[in-house]
């Protein structure tokens, strides 16, 4: 019988998600810099790879998400909503929540949304390396 | 062991709005998205929408877009699909469905209302 | 939206016959997909989930299996009370489509 402990995802699904993901960062990115004349910021931080970066805990899914999820409550942008699900994928059902400050200011606010959707992508990008040369180091 | 029970039956005229609850207990997770289900008389199971009674966030199928509403009341741990602009075709079963595993998204519903007849009838 | 073709839509097999039903996502969903089974004027019951494990309590006879995009629920010696529909759905990403259902009847 199969009832291996799902906490292990399979490393294909894993991947798999992670692409997803940059794919969609990608779309979210490109979207939000339809918005010209907004620079990016110093003052917000998106955490992105775990310490070990080790899978399925790769990235700090539970803090990405609420992020994102601030970012769709700002600003309507619905390939979140994509996002969210497939982040739900890699996030433990205890995971604490995080709770963000958000900008009040309207073009602060569109400050937040670019460098946090920039960062994300980036995050995705090095997710994504991460785990192709994880794997590489495993078949080596 | 989670449990979900379900209103009961209901009577409906057509252009009339449902409202079905779902009541959830037995389980400690916050992080999870709970599913709604109809199935017509001799038809297969249609998926309906889902929430994430958490955050309240929502989605929902095209097909009932505009006329499916899904909620919760995390207070008393109870999710309502309501259906509006009732039609003889939406007489049905409809089912809650509710996850279990480790992570926040579902890759299979475990546990299952024990579902409520809506007749639409005029 | 992901759709979910899933075949036979009815079978009908002796009782120890190795019985298959298989579902085909129209794009890769990894391993997010499960199988019910639903007997008439039932719920349905969650038989197995992420593709392969077995949900508790179900026989040693269910087991489901994937290659690529094509998932198979396989009874490997049919009884009497599996008489039922089983269906297949997907949670990669919403709508988390069903199949459309395989009738099992005993010959």
């Known amino acids: 019988s199969h009832t291996l402990p799902v906490h292990f995802l399979q490393p294909s699904d894993i991947q798999k998600i992670v692409e997803e993901l940059q794919s969609l960062s990608k779309m979210l990115l490109k979207d939000v810099k339809e918005d010209k004349g907004v620079l990016v910021s110093q003052n917000y931080t998106l955490p992105c790879l775990t310490p070990d970066a080790q899978p399925p805990n790769i990235i700090h899914s539970p803090a990405i998400r609420a992020y994102l999820k601030t970012i769709r409550q700002l600003d309507n942008k619905s390939v979140i909503d994509e996002i969210i699900e497939h982040l739900d994928k890699l996030i433990f059902q205890d995971a604490p929540e995080t709770n963000i400050s958000v900008p009040t200011d309207t073009h602060e606010c569109k400050r937040f949304i670019l460098t946090i959707s920039q960062q994300f992508s980036e995050c995705m990008d090095l997710a994504l390396k991460s785990l192709t040369s994880g794997a590489q180091q495993a078949t080596t | 062991q989670v449990q979900l029970v379900q209103s009961g039956a209901e009577v409906k005229k057509p252009g009339s709005s449902v409202k079905v609850s779902c009541k959830a207990s037995g389980y400690t997770r916050t992080r999870y998205w709970m599913q709604w289900v109809r199935q017509a008389p001799g038809q297969g199971l249609e998926w309906m929408g889902a929430?994430?009674?958490?955050?309240?966030?929502?989605r929902y199928s095209q097909k009932f877009k505009g006329r499916v509403t899904i909620t919760a009341d995390k207070s008393t741990s109870t999710a309502y699909m309501e259906l509006s602009s009732l039609r003889s075709e939406d007489t049905a079963v409809y089912y809650c469905?509710?996850?279990?595993?480790?992570?926040?998204?579902?890759?299979?519903?475990?546990?299952w209302g024990q579902g409520t007849t809506v007749t639409v009838s005029s | 939206a992901i759709q979910m073709t899933q075949s036979p839509s009815s079978l009908s097999a002796s009782v120890g016959d190795r019985v298959t039903i298989t579902c085909r996502a129209s794009?890769?969903?990894?391993?997010?997909l499960a199988w019910y089974q639903q007997k008439p004027g039932k719920v349905p019951k969650l038989l197995i989930y992420y593709a392969k494990t077995s949900a508790s309590g179900v026989p040693s006879r269910f087991s489901g299996s994937r290659s690529g995009t094509d998932y198979t629920l396989t009874i490997s010696s049919l009884q009497p009370e599996d008489v039922a529909t089983y269906y297949c759905?997907?949670?990669?990403?919403?709508?988390?489509?069903f199949g459309g259902g395989t009738k099992v009847e005993i010959k």
């Open positions: 929430i994430y009674p958490a955050e309240g966030d929502t």
């Open positions: 759905q997907h949670f990669w990403s919403t709508p988390w489509t």
């Open positions: 794009r890769n969903i990894g391993n997010y």
């Open positions: 469905a509710f996850p279990e595993g480790p992570y926040a998204a579902p890759y299979g519903m475990h546990y």
